[in-house]
């Protein structure tokens, strides 16, 4: 895990002092990952509580800073940073000693192998003539007489150390403040030197430049300023992190910074610096973290305190000890990635004198299997061997090694192989919207296996169909529209995900059933006629240019622009071509149109018709009755309507022979004050039906119908005539 805890020892003022924890993990800060934690760990080294609570400042998801110290005692003790997710969650510890302590460690972090002897050494900073107590994780461990100091140092020798011996050790003068102690950290690897893994049977890769082999996974934890699977490569000055991606802040570079990395590395100064405050440059001939490495450059190489030997032309190697005549493996990726089940070709190029040939180059897998090259390409400056790898399994993940051996010598280069599992969707794609001939689909699905997702293939076909699936490659971050589908049809839709590289296609995910909408009703009706059948009634007729292929009925829309109101009349019968609209508002101008509909979809509207309904008339006249006066005369009498809607302009009388089939006849009573009429010219001995209505602006309702017969046998009349008068 790429996690670094930094303390800036140049800052002595507690109020300005801060600690920073940086995560360089790929994908660090994914929303699913727990955040970085940076805190003081008071479980072993307890000091007085700080005057004010410490506070964390986050710089994005990959960096966190702890501030808010108020007095020197706040700084003394153990700080921890926790980062990474799941099984890779890692804790990095930093132990801070007080610059004014009685005793001070010669070296704070000690990393040793199982079974080694560890020597912790504290030098006297302020002498006190009392015994020195050594503690382990806060518990009493040993006592030394003050006179046992050797050359001003108290030493604790721990023989045959085992992993449980790991922890925080302290050396304190009896009866002195614990803040004046020298605090140490001992890290005991779970294996002997050069070994790792369960049972410690696996060989470490041979970490260079002070890198420490992790006892669980065999990876090198590289000192700050070095990178590569074996820490073989120096970063540019002022850079750190597993890929040299981080930079020391400010103009001073890494001067005065102490770097703490995941166990079993511990803490050290940055490359090129040493001393308790990491402010001293390496002495000539020394380089690396804490200046622990010696250059010992040969063949005219010069020592650089950050990167080691800089070799002249014609020489290479850590000490410039390898002539370019000795075979040398040329640049290779330090880490490669393949998909499970693939049979990749791995190339390894080497130069040297004598020239490497086919049999001189081999590839070693993590399980020890040796592969011979299947093909060799010889060029003037190099030989490239190509290795065909059998079908990869997850067990092939780990460190592979390319080896070259000639009579001039040998060389090897390790590289890490990561075997990845192609992604397989766990969920079906999601329907976002639909129309008659298209579906809008979200291809984003959760998946098992490894990312990143390089492409998404969407497959679809009609439900219960055996035809080939239609395929479309889509952008995983964008919704996709499936076009030219059949209306009202179910489609099975499924997703296939791919990750980069050959064989990166995963299996199909579960399919979702998505159904397209009804087809649009594509016919436009035409309004053929519209008749006012009363102040609040309208009969409408329409036509269609042809029989509709799809349609459930018609929607008639009446728009009353003056009131801003719309009325919709649903005619749920696709064969209908006429409708009677009732309950309309008398005296209103309407704009009328008609559309065909199917399911919830509307077809195009007809051109609108403009209809004016007449105002409503008055109520019916009251108490109409009839009386025969002779064989040709009948008198009608009535009373005015109740509360007419304005001044009555006339009355209309309707006369019809009872039981007859002829049309009725109407007579106007033009003087509205008259409420009586004598109808003359009727046929003798004939029964008649009468009713009457008033007119204001519009015609009113008819009164009740009355029946009356003329008297005796008289002459046949030409037809009724009237005489009216006021009642």
């Amino acid at each position: 895990v790429d996690l670094t805890l930094l303390a800036n020892l140049r800052i002595t003022d507690p109020q300005r002092f801060f600690l920073t924890c940086v995560s360089g993990e790929a994908g660090a800060g994914r929303s699913s990952d727990p955040p970085l934690l940076l805190e003081k760990d008071d479980r072993i080294v307890r000091t007085f509580p700080p005057g004010q609570p410490l506070y964390l400042a986050r710089n994005g998801s990959h960096q966190v800073t702890l501030r808010g110290f108020s007095k020197p005692s706040d700084l003394v003790g153990v700080f921890s940073c926790v980062g990474g997710a799941g099984a890779r969650r890692t804790r990095v510890l930093y132990v801070h000693n007080s610059p004014g302590a009685h005793l001070f460690p010669d070296k704070v972090t000690h990393t040793v192998n199982k079974g080694d002897t560890a020597v912790l050494s504290a030098h006297v900073h302020k002498e006190k003539q009392t015994d020195v107590i050594w503690k382990n994780n806060g518990s009493y461990f040993n006592t030394l007489d003050w006179q046992e100091a050797d050359d001003g140092r108290f030493q604790l020798q721990l023989q045959n150390v085992q992993p449980p011996s790991s922890g925080i050790y302290s050396a304190t003068y009896l009866e002195a403040s614990p803040l004046g102690s020298a605090f140490f950290r001992l890290i005991v690897r779970g294996c002997g030197a050069g070994r790792w893994g369960p049972g410690c049977v696996k060989d470490c890769p041979g970490c260079l430049h002070g890198g420490v082999c992790h006892d669980h996974d065999g990876e090198c934890v590289c000192p700050p300023g070095f990178t590569g699977t074996r820490c073989e490569q120096a970063c540019r000055e002022g850079r750190f992190g597993q890929s040299c991606q981080e930079q020391c802040p400010g103009t001073a570079g890494c001067r005065g910074l102490t770097f703490c990395l995941p166990d079993p590395y511990g803490c050290s100064c940055g490359s090129g610096w040493r001393g308790s405050q990491c402010q001293e440059a390496c002495a000539p001939g020394h380089f690396g973290a804490d200046c622990r490495l010696q250059c010992q450059c040969q063949n005219g190489g010069t020592c650089d305190r950050f990167s080691g030997c800089v070799c002249p032309s014609g020489w290479h190697g850590v000490h410039c000890e390898k002539s370019d005549r000795i075979p040398q493996i040329l640049s290779m990726a330090t880490e490669v990635e393949f998909n499970i089940g693939t049979m990749p070709r791995i190339n390894c190029a080497a130069a040297g004198n004598p020239f490497p040939v086919r049999g001189s180059m081999k590839l070693r897998k993590p399980d020890g299997t040796m592969l011979l090259s299947t093909k060799v390409i010889v060029e003037p400056d190099r030989t490239t061997a190509e290795f065909e790898v059998p079908s990869l399994t997850l067990g092939d993940s780990g460190f592979w090694e390319c080896r070259v051996s000639t009579s001039g010598g040998q060389d090897s280069r390790r590289f890490k192989v990561n075997v990845k599992v192609p992604p397989v969707p766990l969920t079906a794609p999601r329907l976002l919207a639909k129309q008659s001939r298209q579906l809008v689909v979200s291809p984003l699905v959760s998946f098992s296996g490894d990312g990143p997702i390089s492409s998404v293939r969407l497959h679809y076909r009609p439900q219960d169909s055996t035809i080939a699936w239609s395929a479309i490659v889509v952008d995983p971050s964008e919704n996709v529209t499936l076009m030219n589908l059949k209306p009202k049809t179910g489609y099975n839709v499924r997703v296939q995900l791919s990750r980069p590289g050959e064989g990166g296609e995963g299996g199909w995910g579960p399919s979702a059933l998505m159904t397209t909408d009804c087809p649009e009703p594509l016919l436009q009706p035409w309004l053929e006629s519209w008749h006012v059948e009363g102040p609040d009634r309208l009969r409408v007729s329409w036509s269609l240019p042809s029989v509709p292929l799809s349609g459930d009925g018609f929607l008639l829309r009446l728009w009353d622009g003056a009131r801003g109101q719309e009325r919709r009349e649903n005619i749920s019968f696709p064969q209908a071509r006429t409708a009677l609209l009732t309950g309309l508002t008398p005296g209103t101008h309407y704009q009328l149109d008609v559309r065909l509909y199917h399911c919830t979809l509307l077809g195009p509207a007809s051109p609108p018709a403009h209809v004016h309904l007449p105002p409503s008339g008055p109520p019916a006249p009251r108490h109409l009755h009839a009386q025969a006066l002779s064989d040709s005369e009948i008198q009608l009498m009535w009373q005015h309507p109740e509360a007419p809607s304005g001044p009555i302009s006339k009355y209309i009388v309707e006369i019809q022979v009872a039981g007859g089939s002829g049309d009725p006849q109407w007579m106007d009573v033009d003087r509205p004050e008259e409420t009586s009429i004598i109808v003359r010219g009727l046929n003798a001995s004939t029964r008649y039906l009468f009713r009457v209505r008033a007119s204001v602006q519009g015609l009113g309702d008819w009164s009740n119908t009355v029946e009356e017969a003329t008297l005796g046998n008289g002459l046949q009349s030409e037809g009724p005539v009237r005489e009216s008068r006021a009642a």
């Epitope: 035409w526 309004l527 240019p545 051109p607």
Partner: antibody
Framework: EVQLLESGGGLVQPGGSLRLSCAAS????????MVWVRQAPGKGLEWVSV????????GYADSVKGRFTISRDNSKNTLYLQVNSLRAEDTAVYYC?????????????WGQGTLVTVSS | DIQMTQSPSSLSASVGDRVTITCRAS??????LAWYQQKPGKVPKLLIY???TLQSGVPSRFSGSGSGTDFTLTISSLQPEDVATYYC?????????FGQGTRLEIK
């Protein structure tokens, strides 16, 4: 072959009137709605009016409502546009076109147009 | 009334380029949209009807898509003879309004 031929355009003073005609042939005229579309010089297309196959249903753009009247004589296979109270902004080429009967929404058949110029 | 807005109002492209003209309706019009091509002094020519159906005889480099309020006319590989003004028109409700037009020229 479907043919539409407009006539009746010309120079007219503001406030004046014209009657545009569109003679149709090559199809059953009484089965199709018909439209008028106009285009002012150097400008875009403007939909003007529509009439149903029977002539009973008409529609107009707001800019011509109350001044223009569309009609048809199915016995003569002719479409008309009576244009009254003409204004300078009515100056345009007037096209007649056959309305779709449904399913294919677009005007495929157009006449060659007749130019109406309103100027004093 | 439904307003139809075309963009851009004019554009210049090279022969072989992919050209896209968009048309936006002020309210939903389903698929009831047509595209026309008009060359100077000529009658408009129907290219696409009912939003996406290619009129018989029109080259396949022309295509239409969209529904509701947003529509697109695409010329997959511009040819010299495609220089013209292009119009969209809605048929959802009267008046059957046109877009203001897009003038296309060759660079």
């Amino acid at each position: 072959e479907v043919q539409l031929l407009e006539s009746g355009g010309g120079l007219v003073q503001p406030g004046g009137s014209l009657r545009l005609s569109c003679a149709a042939s090559g199809f059953t005229f009484s089965m199709y709605g018909m439209v008028w579309v106009r285009q002012a010089p150097g400008k875009g297309l403007e939909w003007v009016s529509v009439i149903s196959p029977s002539g009973g249903n008409t529609g107009y753009a707001d800019s011509v409502k109350g001044r223009f009247t569309i009609s048809r004589d199915n016995s003569k296979n002719t479409l008309y546009l009576q244009v009254n109270s003409l204004r300078a902004e009515d100056t345009a080429v007037y096209y007649c076109a056959r309305a779709p009967r449904g399913y294919s929404y677009g005007y495929y058949y157009w006449g060659q147009g007749t130019l109406v110029t309103v100027s004093s | 009334d439904i307003q139809m807005t075309q963009s851009p109002s004019s554009l210049s492209a090279s022969v072989g380029d992919r050209v896209t003209i968009t048309c936006r309706a002020s309210q939903g019009i389903g698929h009831y949209l047509a595209w026309y091509q008009q060359k100077p002094g000529k009658v408009p020519k129907l290219l696409i009807y009912t939003a996406s159906t290619l009129q018989s005889g029109v080259p396949s480099r022309f295509s239409g898509s969209g529904s509701g309020t947003d529509f697109t006319l695409t010329i997959s590989s511009l040819q010299p003879e495609d220089v013209a003004t292009y119009y969209c028109q809605q048929f959802n409700s009267y008046p059957h309004t046109f877009g203001q037009g897009t003038r296309l020229e060759i660079k």
